[in-house]
Amino acid sequence: MPSATSHSGSGSKSSGPPPPSGSSGSEAAAGAGAAAPASQHPATGTGAVQTEAMKQILGVIDKKLRNLEKKKGKLDDYQERMNKGERLNQDQLDAVSKYQEVTNNLEFAKELQRSFMALSQDIQKTIKKTARREQLMREEAEQKRLKTVLELQYVLDKLGDDEVRTDLKQGLNGVPILSEEELSLLDEFYKLVDPERDMSLRLNEQYEHASIHLWDLLEGKEKPVCGTTYKVLKEIVERVFQSNYFDSTHNHQNGLCEEEEAASAPAVEDQVPEAEPEPAEEYTEQSEVESTEYVNRQFMAETQFTSGEKEQVDEWTVETVEVVNSLQQQPQAASPSVPEPHSLTPVAQADPLVRRQRVQDLMAQMQGPYNFIQDSMLDFENQTLDPAIVSAQPMNPTQNMDMPQLVCPPVHSESRLAQPNQVPVQPEATQVPLVSSTSEGYTASQPLYQPSHATEQRPQKEPIDQIQATISLNTDQTTASSSLPAASQPQVFQAGTSKPLHSSGINVNAAPFQSMQTVFNMNAPVPPVNEPETLKQQNQYQASYNQSFSSQPHQVEQTELQQEQLQTVVGTYHGSPDQSHQVTGNHQQPPQQNTGFPRSNQPYYNSRGVSRGGSRGARGLMNGYRGPANGFRGGYDGYRPSFSNTPNSGYTQSQFSAPRDYSGYQRDGYQQNFKRGSGQSGPRGAPRGRGGPPRPNRGMPQMNTQQVN
């Protein structure tokens, strides 16, 4: 019975000489009982985050599919042999008789696989979205907590001011906000959260204790403290917050900086300064003055700046409201104007008036198309974005081109008048804009943007301050960004409010300047509130932003420069030469691959901006102290990250996607510094229950920790 009999398709083969090598038949019987080993079908690559059940289902379907494919292949072979007149054995005949069934099963299995893969992808998307939402909620909660800490620090700080104490006791409308007893309680609590240095304890132990007190206060625990409970203390603090006492401008005499109009002069030849020995902390002013505006968010309605999740934004977050056009820099083109650069010496000035003058001059420069985005607003398809990352985009979707080299403008120092009511803010750490731009548009046809700096040589004792930010924006990124419909384009540079372009002044004394840690979010597009679909543009904004902050007015070795760039790292590093055009001093550096994590002499930003003056290690970690004039002084330690990132080492955003723990480590080279100067009052003494000389560091516990990898 030539297997003839084999009805179940027993493999007997054709009538002719049996086909070689066991191409036996009937195995093809539909349904193929035994799962054949894999053939043709690639494994269903569905994603890393796949539920186990889904993986198993897809695995089974895949196996079945491969089996059926194999079977169908055999049947096709049998069919062909039959057509040639060859005799098949019973197993083969049985198999062939099931051809239609096998074909149907195969189609069904394919359809099933497609469905499950789609389902799997949906599940993954949902998981990702949920995770992202949870992450955002965590970050938002964290940010709110941080905000509360900052507010608390600000209030506690201000309570050292006799005038503030008196105001709070008297109240705004005769109704006392705080009693003497409550002030005393806050004074006592202040000593817990900013304790005197106890040399018997390790510093981090001491601050650990302080942080526990802060935490318990934020939690409003019923635990006893300072003769009361954290809950009571929290209520007292909240009462102060709710009184809006610190919001009213009469309490903060604002030093207003005059606005400066940029004089667009015709081309002026670059003046290349001669190389001369200069102090390490010298900066060159950029050659074009721009009018920009630094908006004090404390005086803006919170609701004006909300994320897609309608989160409330910390009132002290900084937001740039208007955008001036991008700075156009033609290769070897002359600078439109040559302002008289002012000098900023790296050390604190003895004369408060001079210091005020310096501060005002720098504050006037605080303009630039940066939107300081709070982290909780970032709902982005890719990995969670780091808080200390800046997102730079073209100003509108139609401008599809590389970003130019963007440089901070200089200010005419002689145009400044000392303002008597100004708070003496340390000049070493002044908020400066990272980017400025001219009023001229530029087109995509200009592939290279070379800086033109016309500055005079300065005597050594008058070094010129300049911060240059070079942002290299991959053309792919701008293209991707521009290709989105205007409605869904995250308008990072667009004006957020209807404030005029040139504001009448800058509030130097407002709370944010004294207490708010500015976090730059670069490379983090804000998805429009109504258009979650933009989240799907996965690779849209993963550009390489190499931000270079040079402290040299003259050209130096490139390797040295690379170690002196701001530690702002985002996305996947693209080190190709055509993506990075560095501007350094008055010379254009040849494009080259920048290290992703270079060292910076200005490694962090706080509300006072880039700390100036202290050489590395000179004054420690921005440990401010109040001198007799109650002016804030502080040094900083340039932070050198312990991780390297050569262009090929592949640091991507996922390295930093874990929820931030500000107390435990340093994020991305930004020193989380919360030491603040106070207002104008005299040194805090007896009212705070601490006799003796004024205490250094009347601010929050030092939160300057080192980055860990």
């Epitope: 019975m1 030539p2 297997s3 003839a4 009999t5 084999s6 009805h7 179940s8 398709g9 027993s10 493999g11 007997s12 083969k13 054709s14 009538s15 002719g16 000489p17 049996p18 086909p19 070689p20 090598s21 066991g22 191409s23 036996s24 038949g25 009937s26 195995e27 005799r87 098949l88 054995n89 019973q90 197993d91 005949l93 049985d94 062939v96 008789s97």
Partner: antibody, heavy 114, light 112 residues
């Protein structure tokens, strides 16, 4: 239910003839099937006799069966036949019909004895 | 006719033992081979077709392998219900080169 039932067995004298039938039920003889006859002598192994392809009637025989045994089918009756001539004592066995090599009938006993 | 030689003709093994039966064809038959189990007084039951494919409903402890002239049938873990005689059969369609659907002599499997 698909099944095969053999009949026609019994006692026959040596040199005599016998015609075995195999009635198929549950499936039609019009399909692509090989129908076979297999026998098994008492206490011995299985021995293939012949097959016929229902579709076109092509047949094949074991060498020892050629000339004495004939396989045929009647598609209209859904029946398979085995004509045995010149029977010998050694032809005593249980005779099975099978469709392909998967479906077997229970068998019918043929005894050749004088 | 093609000749099929099966060995051993009988074997005795313990429950749980691995049992192997060989079948050799007098000429290459590719993979056109079936294995049967026959219990006393019953018709044979096919277990394996095309040398290695397990029939539906057959326990996975039964397996087959080989092609050409040498084939092997294995019971990975002998069970009491496996006591039977096992046969191999060439299932090729008769042709000028391969003729007949001969059976092997059978292997009687017993439990020790």
């Amino acid at each position: 239910e698909v099944q095969l039932v053999e009949s026609g067995g019994g006692l026959v004298q040596p040199g005599g003839s016998l015609r075995l039938s195999c009635a198929a039920s549950g499936f039609s003889f019009s399909g692509s099937y090989y129908m076979s006859w297999v026998r098994q002598a008492p206490g011995k192994g299985l021995e293939w006799i012949a097959y016929i392809y229902i579709g076109d009637g092509v047949t094949a025989y074991a060498n020892w069966a050629k000339g004495r045994f004939t396989i045929s089918r009647d598609n209209s009756k859904n029946t398979l036949y085995l004509q045995m001539n010149s029977l010998r004592a050694e032809d005593t066995a249980v005779y099975y019909c099978a469709r392909g090599n998967k479906l077997w009938g229970p068998g019918t006993l043929v005894t050749v004895s004088s | 006719d093609i000749q099929m030689t099966q060995s051993p003709s009988s074997l005795s093994a313990s429950v749980g033992d691995r049992v192997t039966i060989k079948c050799q064809a007098s000429q290459s038959i590719s993979s056109y081979l079936a294995w049967y189990q026959q219990k006393p007084g019953k018709a044979p039951k096919r277990l394996i077709y095309d040398a290695s494919n397990l029939d539906s409903g057959v326990p996975s402890r039964f397996s087959g392998s080989g092609s050409g002239t040498d084939f092997t049938f294995t019971i990975s873990s002998l069970q009491p219900e496996d006591i039977a005689t096992y046969y191999c059969q060439c299932t090729a369609v008769s042709s000028a080169t391969i003729y007949g659907n001969a059976f092997g002599g059978g292997t009687k499997v017993e439990i020790k």
